[in-house]
């Protein structure tokens, strides 16, 4: 029952809470069988998703999954918003669900996550390389 369709494993309503000034890697987990598809990131502006042309991206290849990574070096306040990755594969376009970045500006302590938020989102306590995509293999 193994399908060879390209899959993008971004869940509906996924979100990350991050701090401005920190580095961050936004990952698009990609499953493919033979040829790696061409993957891009875009940022939602209303109903339009604007392609991110001049941003640093990279691939991380693991045994059963690959990650197309959008790098934030560092996170800026206006990086707040929703992002989507898309894969071009054999002339088919496959789009992921959107994932939302909530950027807290460290200059504005009043906007920092509350204790309740920290308790319900333990990944906020982690640095960027421990953000809440837990990669199980």
């Amino acid at each position: 029952k193994e399908s060879c369709d390209v899959q993008l494993y971004i869940k509906r309503q996924s979100e990350h809470s991050i701090l401005a000034g920190d580095p961050f890697e936004l990952e698009c987990p990609v499953k493919y069988c033979a040829n790696r598809p061409h993957v891009t990131w875009c940022k939602l502006n209303g109903t339009t998703c604007v392609k991110l042309e001049d941003r640093q991206t990279s691939w991380k290849e693991e045994k059963n999954i690959s990650f197309f990574i959008l790098h934030f070096e560092p996170v800026l306040p206006n990086d707040n918003g929703s992002y989507r990755c898309s894969a071009n594969f054999q002339s088919n376009l496959i789009e992921s669900h959107s994932t939302t970045l909530y950027v807290t500006d460290v200059k504005s302590a009043s906007e920092r996550p509350s204790k309740d938020e920290m308790a319900s989102r333990p990944w906020l306590l982690y640095r960027h390389h421990h953000h809440h995509h837990h990669h199980h293999h």
């Epitope: 899959q7 494993y9 869940k11 809440h132 990669h135």
Partner: antibody
Framework: QVTLKESGPTLVKPTQTLTLTCTFS??????????VSWIRQPPGKALEWLAH???????RFNPSLKSRLTITKDTSKNQVVLTMTNMDPVDTATYYC?????????????WGQGTLVTVSS | DVVMTQSPLSLPVTLGQPASISCKST???????????LNWLQQRPGQSPRSLIY???KLDSGVPDRFSGSGSGTDFTLKISRVEAEDVGVYYC?????????FGQGTKVEIK
């Protein structure tokens, strides 16, 4: 071969907490795209989705029941546990766990046999 | 929540004849990713549900090709080209586009 099996009490009293275990085989809940949902079906009625747990331990709940539900997974034991607090006779139902496969989004491709839970004093 | 409404609720059919079940949703099931997450289940008497169709028209593994799904937006149809005795049971549509995921009330297919 994918199988799922629900286990737990057949009878609970009102106000008690229900704990159900889904034990599965034939897939790993650490594989990207995999998940397990709990769905219930009151006698003679339709299905109602309760909760879902994803491969990365992310969770989703039916908002109408969210305050009463918890869902956890033990990947090493191939188990998913649902707890539902403050049980009421209207919660009498057959409770199913189902595997969530992924094709852009979750769909339930394998179901357990179900376990009938009766809530009565 | 998205309400899924099936019709008819009861469908007496003749063996070898076609059958059709309608499913309507209160919101469009076309997702922003371009896919439509509408699925169909079959529940035979005394059994647990079984996946028939996902993404409107994709047959799950082991499902006979006499079953087919179609539709878009808010209107969907499950068709059985020639009903067999083993097709007796309750059929449910359900949507995975909006949380919470919701099911139709079911259509009972029985032999005349």
């Amino acid at each position: 071969q994918v199988t799922l099996k629900e286990s737990g009490p057949t009878l609970v009293k009102p106000t008690q907490t229900l704990t159900l275990t889904c034990t599965f085989s034939g897939f790993s809940l650490s594989t990207f795209g995999m998940g397990v949902s709990w769905i219930r079906q009151p006698p003679g009625k339709a299905l109602e989705w309760l909760a879902h747990i994803y491969w990365d331990d992310d969770k989703r709940f039916n908002p109408s029941l969210k305050s009463r539900l918890t869902i956890t997974k033990d990947t090493s034991k191939n188990q998913v546990v649902l707890t539902m607090t403050n049980m009421d006779p209207v919660d009498t139902a057959t409770y199913y766990c189902a595997r969530g496969n992924w094709d852009g989004e979750t769909y339930f491709d394998y179901w357990g046999q179900g376990t009938l839970v009766t809530v009565s004093s | 929540d998205v309400v899924m409404t099936q019709s008819p609720l009861s469908l007496p059919v003749t063996l070898g004849q076609p059958a059709s079940i309608s499913c309507k949703s209160t919101q469009s099931l076309l997702d922003s990713d371009g896919k439509t997450y509408l699925n169909w289940l079959q529940q035979r008497p005394g059994q647990s549900p079984r996946s028939l169709i996902y993404l409107v028209s994709k047959l799950d593994s082991g499902v006979p090709d006499r079953f087919s799904g179609s539709g878009s937006g808010t209107d969907f149809t499950l068709k059985i080209s020639r009903v067999e005795a083993e097709d007796v049971g309750v059929y449910y549509c359900w949507q995975g586009t909006h949380f919470p995921w919701t099911f139709g009330q079911g259509t009972k297919v029985e032999i005349k």
